[in-house]
Each structure stands twice: as structure tokens, then as C-alpha cells.
């Protein structure tokens, strides 16, 4: 067979379709791949054509597209299950050729199977909703092409295993299930059935996606910097370890953004002669607001490090900030000694207990323990 | 350990009401459902409806429609099954029963409470 | 709604003994399909959900077999604390459907 542009195996289009349900699979060929449409290709002689191999297999074959009441048909670019089986699995090819052009592409279509409850081994999208909001609504995914606009479906939603009726606060409005308010109760997979009839049969499309419910940007605040603070004074002897956590809290913002960093002396650390070590630790609220914590550490500190500026920056869609630790070198104590007693006085061991980190304006000694992520 | 602990058992008149109250412990973040079920002396076991604490959600089963009221209070953790229009057949031991999540298939009836016997009798 | 018959209705077995109980669906429920235990003054327990799959803390002697409209409940070696009434219930339709029951009685 003379050559043909293979494309190979798409698998960026790990297509999923339920077991006994309709599907409709265009060629990608001119989805991601070609710079002219179906149509185009048609007018201008161009045939496609469609063959797969089975899964464990690697035997191309035809398919078949004379089985009974057409259950595998194609209609233009579209490769047609009316319903799919679950040895359907496997990969697809569609090529596009004439007696002096050809280009082909394979994808993977997995036919995967749900229990009465919904679950299944599909990747569900994520839909997120903002909390205590307003109304706000989903819509009932991937249900276009299916049929035309004169038949009218039924669609149910459900929550799980259970059918959404009587819920406080949310609707279920056709293909939009609508959220009048939501709540963090509100999180969960949320499942459209769409039952419809085509030449005396009845179809059923099934789709479920998951609800997020985040932070409402009526909230949102720009990055807040918990530390470090005017309260913490990071005290050190050369020669000991100088670890400064910068830790900032970001409102959820979709699609925002969140940088922390720190600047030494107004330099990236990685601009600085010094042996510095940063670690990153990040966690997220149940509305995925984000606390990242970044462990500023010198492992021996001298005297001009204790010198230098330590500033911990933040940045997000809601803007920027910046706070300098309080940085210095500890005065070694003085040693005082009793006459005749030849031990330390009690100003001494005060001295000693006032180790590392101390908090101006209170008597109170704070041990910090960090953890390395 | 979720438990659910029921009322106690309740003798009543034809043509009144019962209130059954199932209270649950330990529950977990998660929305999930309770189901009512009940049983006639020497009978089997017969499903009435349900309720999601946290969404408000509920169904009845057909014969019971008009007649069954499952209602929960979240702050105290509580369901309640009201019966009305009683008649001695509804004489029967009335569990609650739930799942973990909402997502559980074939686990909704996973723990249940200890039962309450409701006796209609003139 | 689908109708669960279940047979016999009184299995007679002497401890240590094979019980095999059946369950048939008025139409196809799939493997949505739980059997319980019951006690005399007990709550049901959950023993087999989908079909096959022991709950937490089941022995292993109890096994669950069948799908659509056909299935058994199996306990290979009844011990005394299996003596009991034995539900099936299909959760593949609203509503939720018990079957009438078995109940396992020593020989």
C-alpha cells in the first residue's frame, strides 16, 4: 500500500462511552489534526474510511458496519454505536485518502460499565460552583447530535444513587440542574439520564460530572502573609540554623495563579553566593482557598546573612504583597558571677532560655517546629 | 462508629398517628440517606422511603404516599418516620437503616437501628 | 415494580451442611442484588451486596452467585449462629424490593 501521513495513536482522546448506550465518535483528523473540514474533504473527492483492532489484539479489521438494526453506522465524520458493546473496546482508525492523498489517526475507545448507582472507571469532569452564590447551574454534558430538535427527551438527575426531587436547593430544571445556593453539602457527583426515542427504540444517555463547591469571589482578598509578622524576630548566633517560614493564605480564584517567593537582599535566592534551601508546602481549605508555606533555611548562618534583607512576596489575580523578617544577630550574653559562689546568677539562665526566636512586646518564649516537605 | 438508636416502642389507637425518631452517631462529613423499612409480625421486610439529612431530599414508596411523612432535623443528627391514619396492619417492628455516602451501591442498608415496635390496636 | 421470590420458604439443614437459597427477580435487576441476615429479635445485617460481594465482617463461608434473574445465596458449612431468615433485596429499580424470605431451620 503506497504511503500515508499515520498520525499514530491519539491518545489524548482517551475516549470513554458507557456499555449499552448511544455514541457518536467524530474522526479527529479534522478536529486536531487537518486544516479543512469533512465537508471540504467530501467535495473534493476525498473518501473516509474506518477500521479498528480489538483490544489485546494487533489484527487490523473493517468494521462492520452491517449488523443488525445498523448498530455501527457512519454518517459523514461521525462513527455511529446504536448502542455500544463492551468488546467493543479497542482502537479506531479513521483515514482519509484518494487515489493520490492519504492521512490517518487512531484513538483509543473504551467501553466501560456503571452500576445502578453510577459508578463506573469513567474520568468525570469537575464543575465548579461558588459558594452561597446565588443560582447557579449545570448543564447536562456531551448530549448534542444525539437526536433532533423535534424530540424532546426525558431527563433525570440524580445524586448518586438517589433521584434529585424535594432537595432544598437544587432544581432540576430539563437538561440544567440549578443550584438556588450552594453549600459545601452540595459536593458530590451529580448523574443527567437522557431517555430518548429513535425508530421505535429507546435510548438512554448517561452522564455524570462533579460538583466543586469553592470560595465565592465576593470573598476573595488578595494573598494574606499569616508570616512572617512585626511579632516574630528570627534571632541567631553565626554558625547556627536560620529557618524563616513564609506562610500565605489565597482566596480560591479560578484560574488564578498563586506565587510565593522569597528575595534576599531584593535577589532571588538563587542569585545569592549563599547556601540557601527553600521547601514548599501547600493545603487547601474544603473551599479551596490555599495556605502554601515556604521554609526559608540557612543551614550555618554568618554574620553578613544576618545582615541581609529577607523579604517573603506573594502574588495572585487579586494582587501582590510583600513583609521582611525581622532579622538579627544575637548579642552574646554577658557573664556575670557571684563572689565567692563561683557559679552562674539566675540573670544567666534567663539569657539561656531566651533562645533563637523571641516575641517583642510579650514575656512569652515561642519554639517553632518546622516541617520539611 | 455510626450507630442509630430509635425511640421506643408505642401502642396507639386506629386512625392516629405514630412519630418514630432514629438518631445517628458518628456521622460523617458526607451526605447520606435513611431509609425507613418495616416489618409485620411474622412477615417480611417492606421499604417505605427515604431521606438525605444534609439536601433535604426524599421519596416515598407508592403505597405509602399520603399517608408517610420522613422528615430529619441535621442539628441533632435526627430522621423521623410519622405514620398517620393507623390501622391495625401497620402494626409492625419499624427499622431505620443507612449507608456511608450516597454512593454506595447495595450498601444504603449497611447499619441499622434497633428497631421500633408500633402496636395499633383498639 | 420488579417482584422478588425467594425459595423455599424453610430450608432444613443439620450444622455442618451445605444450604443453597434461591432467588428469582420478576425481571432483569443485573448484579444490584443484596442478601441479609435476620435473627429472631434482631435488626437485618447485610451479608452479600452485588451479588457476590461479602460485606465487612462476613465469613467466608457465606458466597453469592447469579445475575439478572437468577440468584443463591450459598453457605457452605452452616454453623449455629447461621440459623436464621435469609432477605434478598434488588436495588437496580425504585423502589427497593425485599424478597419474602427464607428461613433456615436445624434438621
Known amino acids: 500500500s503506497e504511503r500515508c501521513d499515520d498520525w499514530g495513536l491519539d491518545t489524548m482522546r482517551q475516549i470513554q462511552v458507557f456499555e449499552d448506550e448511544p455514541a457518536r465518535i467524530k474522526c479527529p483528523l479534522f478536529e486536531h489534526f487537518l486544516k479543512f473540514n469533512y465537508s471540504t474533504a467530501h467535495s473534493a473527492g476525498l473518501t473516509l474510511i474506518w477500521y479498528w483492532t480489538r483490544q489485546d489484539r494487533d489484527l487490523e479489521e473493517p468494521i462492520n458496519f452491517r449488523l443488525p438494526e445498523n448498530r455501527i453506522s457512519k454518517e459523514k465524520d461521525v462513527l455511529w454505536f446504536r448502542p455500544t458493546l463492551l468488546n467493543d473496546t479497542g482502537n479506531y482508525t479513521c483515514m482519509l485518502r484518494n487515489t493520490t492523498y492519504c492521512s490517518k489517526v487512531a484513538f483509543p475507545l473504551e467501553v466501560v460499565q456503571k452500576d445502578s448507582c453510577f459508578n463506573s472507571p469513567m474520568k468525570l469532569p469537575v464543575h465548579k460552583l461558588y459558594i452561597e452564590y446565588g443560582i447557579q447551574r449545570i448543564t447536562c454534558p456531551n448530549v448534542d447530535g444525539y437526536f433532533p430538535s423535534s424530540v424532546k427527551p426525558t431527563i433525570t438527575w440524580y445524586m448518586g444513587c438517589y433521584k434529585i426531587q424535594n432537595f432544598n436547593n437544587v432544581i432540576p430544571e430539563g437538561m440544567n440542574l440549578s443550584f438556588l445556593i450552594a453549600f459545601i453539602s452540595n459536593n458530590g457527583n451529580y448523574t443527567c439520564v437522557v431517555t430518548y426515542p429513535e425508530n421505535g427504540r429507546t435510548f438512554h444517555l448517561t452522564r455524570t460530572l462533579t460538583v466543586k463547591v469553592v470560595g465565592s469571589p465576593k470573598n476573595a482578598v488578595p494573598p494574606v502573609i499569616h508570616s512572617p509578622n512585626d511579632h516574630v524576630v528570627y534571632e541567631k548566633e553565626p554558625g547556627e540554623e536560620l529557618l524563616i517560614p513564609c506562610t500565605v493564605y489565597f482566596s480560591f480564584l479560578m484560574d488564578s495563579r498563586n506565587e510565593v517567593w522569597w528575595t534576599i537582599d531584593g535577589k532571588k535566592p538563587d542569585d545569592i553566593p549563599i547556601d540557601v534551601t527553600i521547601n514548599e508546602s501547600i493545603s487547601h481549605s474544603r473551599t479551596e482557598d490555599e495556605t502554601r508555606t515556604q521554609i526559608l533555611s540557612i543551614k550555618k548562618v554568618t554574620s553578613e546573612d544576618l545582615k541581609r534583607s529577607y523579604v517573603c512576596h506573594a502574588r495572585s489575580a487579586k494582587g501582590e504583597v510583600a513583609k521582611a523578617a525581622t532579622v538579627k544577630q544575637k548579642v552574646p550574653a554577658p557573664r556575670y558571677t557571684v563572689e565567692g559562689g563561683g557559679g552562674t546568677g539566675g540573670l544567666n539562665d534567663i539569657f539561656e532560655a531566651q533562645k533563637i526566636e523571641w516575641h517583642e512586646g510579650g514575656g512569652h518564649h515561642h519554639h517553632h517546629h518546622h516541617h520539611h516537605h | 462508629q455510626v450507630q442509630l438508636v430509635q425511640s421506643g416502642a408505642e401502642v396507639k389507637k386506629p386512625g392516629s398517628s405514630v412519630k418514630v425518631s432514629c438518631k445517628a452517631s458518628?456521622?460523617?462529613?458526607?451526605?447520606?440517606?435513611i431509609q425507613w423499612v418495616r416489618q409485620a409480625p411474622g412477615q417480611g421486610l417492606e421499604w417505605m422511603g427515604y431521606?438525605?439529612?444534609?439536601?433535604?431530599?426524599?421519596d416515598y414508596a407508592q403505597k405509602f404516599q399520603g399517608r408517610v411523612t420522613i422528615t430529619a432535623d441535621e442539628s441533632t443528627s435526627t430522621a423521623y418516620m410519622e405514620l398517620s391514619s393507623l390501622r391495625s396492619e401497620d402494626t409492625a417492628v419499624y427499622y431505620c437503616?443507612?449507608?456511608?455516602?450516597?454512593?454506595?451501591?447495595?450498601?444504603?442498608?449497611?447499619?441499622w437501628g434497633q428497631g421500633t415496635l408500633v402496636t395499633v390496636s383498639s | 415494580e420488579i417482584v422478588m421470590t425467594q425459595s423455599p420458604a424453610t430450608l432444613s439443614v443439620s450444622p455442618g451442611e451445605r444450604a443453597t437459597l434461591s432467588c428469582r427477580a420478576s425481571q432483569s435487576v443485573s448484579s444490584n442484588l443484596a442478601w441479609y441476615q435476620q435473627k429472631p429479635g434482631q435488626a437485618p445485617r447485610l451479608l452479600i451486596y452485588?451479588?457476590?460481594t461479602r460485606a465487612t465482617g462476613i465469613p467466608a463461608r457465606f458466597s453469592g452467585s447469579g445475575s439478572g434473574t437468577e440468584f443463591t445465596l450459598t453457605i457452605s458449612s452452616l454453623q449455629s449462629e447461621d440459623f436464621a431468615v435469609y432477605y434478598c433485596?434488588?436495588?437496580?429499580?425504585?423502589?427497593?424490593?425485599f424478597g419474602q424470605g427464607t428461613k433456615v431451620e436445624i434438621k
Open positions: 433485596q434488588q436495588y437496580n429499580n425504585w423502589p427497593w424490593t
Open positions: 431521606i438525605i439529612p444534609s439536601l433535604g431530599g426524599y
Open positions: 452485588g451479588a457476590s
Open positions: 458518628g456521622s460523617p462529613a458526607e451526605p447520606y440517606a
Open positions: 437503616a443507612r449507608g456511608q455516602t450516597l454512593y454506595e451501591t447495595g450498601r444504603q442498608f449497611d447499619i
